[in-house]
Amino acid sequence: TPTTLASHSTKTDASSTHHSSVPPLTSSNHSTSPQLSTGVSFFFLSFHISNLQFNSSLEDPSTDYYQELQRDISEMFLQIYKQGGFLGLSNIKFRPGSVVVQLTLAFREGTINVHDVETQFNQYKTEAASRYNLTISDVSVSDVPFPFSAQSGAGVPG
C-alpha cells in the first residue's frame, strides 16, 4: 500500500545527474493510458524551484545539497499523492535554471490521469513553500510514452 512507500530503495549513479528512487511497484488490472502489461501508468513531471540556485553539487548524488533536496522532494510527493493508486517516484534529475526538477511518477493504471496529476500538484504549491521552503513554478506534466525508457531506472517487477 502507499503507506509503505516512505522508505524508498535507492540507487545512485555518480557519473550522471540522476538519482532513482524506486519503491516496489505493484500490479493492478485497471486500464488507462499510457499503460504497461504490469498495470502501472507513468507520468513525467517537470517544475522549477525558483528560490534555489543550481550548482555543481546537484550533479553529484553524494553531496548534502543533492541528498537533502532529493529527500524533501520525495517526501513532498508522498504527501501530495497519498492515495491508494500512488506507487512512487523515480529518476529524479536536477537541471540548471534556478533548479529545474524532472522526475517520473508511477500510479496504478486507471487511478489518475495527466490532468489530475497536475491539478493535485498545483494544489500543493502553497504548502510546499511553507513546509519545504520550495517555491514551485512552471509545472509541466505529460504521459510517459510506451514503451517506457529502459534507462529511466523505474523497474517494474513482472
Epitope: T1, P2, T3, T32, Y81, K82, Q83, G84, G85, G110, T111, I112, N113, V114, H115, D116, T119, Q120, Q123
Partner: antibody
C-alpha cells in the same frame, strides 16, 4: 469486498449539531481518501470535502468550511462528519464515498438528515 | 470553480433506443470527467471514469467520449434498468464539482 456502512437517519433541531458516521471495511482504511457528498431532496450532488485517515489531512469545499468537520478513527476504520449550526438548508442525504483522491467508486447507502422544529 | 452543465434535464426514451447525455465544462478540463448513475432512492454508481474508461461490472452498452469542455455519455441500447439520474463530475479543479444531472425516463 469494500463496504461503507453509514449511520441511521437523524431528525435534529435548527441550531443544533449532528455527527454521522461511515464505517469502512474490506480495504486499507488509512490509505484512501474518504469523501462526503450532499444531496438535497430532489436535487443534485455536492462535494463537501475529504479526509485522509492515515494522517487526518483534509480538503474542504469552501462552501462547507465552518459547516462540516471531517474526522476519522483509524482504530475502528470509521469516518465521521459533524454538521454544525443546522438550518433547513442542511436537510438532505449525506453520502460517504471512497475511490481515489478525485473520483468515487464505492459509496455508502446515505444518511438522511432532517432539520425541523 | 469548474461549472458543469448537463443537458437536457430530462430525456425520454423507449427501450432499445440509443441515448446520449451531454456535460459541458466551463473551462478546459482535459479528460478529467467521471459519470455516475443514481437510481431512485439509491446511491450513485460510477459507470465511466476519465471521460471514456470503462469499469468492470458496468455493462458494455455504456460508453463515454469527449475532452476539453464537451463530454458525452452514451447508452447504445437502453434497458429498463437504466432508468435513473445521470451525473457528471470533474476532477481537474478544486473543489470537485458535479453537474446538475439528467433524468432518464421511459416514454
Amino acid at each position: 469486498q469494500v463496504h461503507l456502512q453509514q449511520s441511521g437517519a437523524e431528525l435534529v433541531r435548527p441550531g443544533s449539531s449532528v455527527k454521522i458516521s461511515c464505517k469502512a471495511s474490506g480495504y486499507e482504511f488509512n490509505s484512501f481518501w474518504m469523501n462526503w457528498v450532499k444531496q438535497r431532496p430532489g436535487q443534485g450532488l455536492e462535494w463537501i470535502g475529504q479526509i485522509y485517515p492515515g494522517d487526518g489531512d483534509t480538503n474542504y469545499n469552501g462552501k462547507f468550511k465552518g459547516k462540516a468537520t471531517l474526522t476519522a478513527d483509524k482504530s475502528s476504520s470509521t469516518a465521521y462528519m459533524q454538521l454544525s449550526s443546522l438550518t433547513s438548508e442542511d436537510s438532505g442525504i449525506y453520502f460517504c464515498a471512497r475511490g481515489y483522491k478525485a473520483w468515487f467508486i464505492y459509496w455508502g447507502q446515505g444518511t438522511l438528515v432532517t432539520v425541523s422544529e | 470553480d469548474v461549472l458543469l452543465t448537463q443537458s437536457p434535464a430530462i430525456l425520454s426514451v423507449s427501450p432499445g433506443e440509443r441515448v446520449s447525455f451531454s456535460c459541458r465544462a466551463s473551462q478546459n478540463i482535459g479528460t478529467s470527467i467521471h459519470w455516475y448513475q443514481q437510481s431512485t432512492n439509491g446511491s450513485p454508481r460510477l459507470i465511466i471514469k476519465y471521460a471514456s474508461e470503462s469499469l468492470s461490472g458496468i455493462p458494455s452498452r455504456f460508453s463515454g467520449s469527449g475532452s476539453g469542455t464537451d463530454f458525452t455519455l452514451t447508452i447504445n441500447s437502453v434497458e429498463s434498468e437504466d432508468i435513473a439520474d445521470y451525473y457528471c463530475q470533474q476532477s481537474n479543479g478544486w473543489p470537485l464539482t458535479f453537474g446538475g444531472g439528467t433524468k432518464l425516463e421511459l416514454k
